[in-house]
């Protein structure tokens, strides 16, 4: 059928979602574009078992997330309610700082070393991560 | 043996349409992304449209965005383009492609044998 | 888009010679840089990925090297079988993936 009931290769499984973490950087709009081809989008966390998980997964490390306010308010790439959902904002953030000297604010959130999110510019190269849920009409694990 | 194969190429008129089909066996075509790739005589490579494993996901070359349409018949393991509105510029050898991806490692690793579309009055 | 541009355009060598390609970006796109070899009236094929990484059954006198924006593709000793045109590609800003205009070798 065309339910997916196991995570494909190379993802972990987690609370009947699968995710993928990357190794490399890419800007966010282009790692939103990579997870959207492997069907998946960029991590949407709901709560504060799914920060951990992330959070132990990805390390010290500067990581992008499915959150962005591009168009004015901070939405989930999947739909999620962002203002009644799970925040985890580091003290005095979101702040769309304009002191980088890039151009603009800061759009995009990530998780920051410590786990806690940052508004950032969307353009800095950052790893990511692709979160897709079982259960959901898809593809079988890729067999190379 | 993995293989794509590429039909439905030809002469046609400038306004036109025409529909290409690439049949994949040889590998489990769903799980992957899939793309299309010109080569119009003489000249390089051109990349022109890419779709996601379910089909859920479309993405394409500014030179043939809103003209062109990609889809895919997993059951048939069929990617399929559908050209409409062509141009002479559109003249070229159009291949199918496997999109492989694992972070570092995103690639095109199987590619049709390609199909010529001539765009001509 | 990122522009990928290819020196030189053409070049003639001998048998066993050492070549070198060059393929610069417009913009850093790390190591998200692979190499294609294309021979006349076929599809191209895989050579190299994530800028250094040869594809499996591809011959090690093939080797790729840079990060950032610029990239070489040598062949340590040119075979007859690599008399072809070969192609960059970056898959940084994917899905707009963007090929450079290709380098013909030709026999000397």
């Known amino acids: 059928g065309s339910e997916r009931t196991c995570c494909p290769v190379n993802w972990v499984e987690h609370e009947r979602s699968c995710y993928w973490f990357s190794r490399s950087g890419k800007a966010w709009a282009d790692a939103d574009n990579y997870c959207r081809l492997e069907d998946a989008h960029l991590v949407v966390v709901t709560s504060w078992e799914e920060q951990k998980f992330v959070q132990h997964h990805i390390g010290p490390v500067n990581t992008w997330m499915g959150l962005h306010d591009q168009n004015g308010p901070w939405k989930w790439v999947d739909g999620t309610d962002y203002e009644t959902g799970f925040k985890n904002w580091r003290p005095e953030q979101p702040d769309d700082w304009y002191g980088h000297g890039l151009g603009g604010g800061e759009d995009c959130a990530h998780f920051t070393d410590d786990g806690r999110w940052n508004d950032d510019v969307c353009q800095r190269p950052y790893r990511w991560v692709c979160e897709t849920e079982l259960d959901k009409a898809s593809q079988e694990p890729p067999l190379l | 043996e993995v293989q794509l194969l590429e039909s439905g190429g030809g002469l046609v008129q400038p306004g036109g349409s025409l529909r290409l089909s690439c049949a994949a066996s040889g590998f489990t075509f769903r799980s992957y992304a899939m793309s299309w790739i010109r080569q119009a005589p003489g000249r390089g490579l051109e990349w022109s449209s890419v779709i996601s494993g379910s089909g859920g996901s479309t993405y394409y070359a500014d030179s043939v965005k809103g003209r062109f349409t990609i889809s895919r018949d997993n059951s048939k393991n069929t990617l399929y383009l559908q050209m409409s509105s062509l141009r002479a510029e559109d003249t070229a050898v159009y291949y199918c492609a496997k999109r492989y991806n694992s972070g570092w490692h995103d690639v095109f690793d199987i590619w049709g044998q390609g199909t010529m579309v001539t765009v001509s009055s | 888009d990122i522009q990928m541009t290819q020196s030189p355009s053409s070049l003639s060598a001998s048998v066993g010679d050492r070549v070198t390609i060059t393929c610069r970006a417009s913009?850093?796109?790390?190591?998200?840089l692979n190499w294609y070899q294309q021979k006349p009236g076929k599809a191209p094929e895989l050579l190299i990925y994530a800028a250094s990484s040869l594809q499996s059954g591809v011959p090690s006198r093939f080797s790729g090297s840079g990060s950032g924006t610029d990239f070489i593709l040598t062949i340590s000793s040119l075979q007859p079988e690599d008399f072809a045109t070969y192609y960059c590609q970056q898959s940084y800003n994917t899905p707009t993936w963007t090929f450079g205009q290709g380098t013909k070798v030709e026999i000397k």
């Open positions: 913009q850093s796109i790390s190591r998200y």
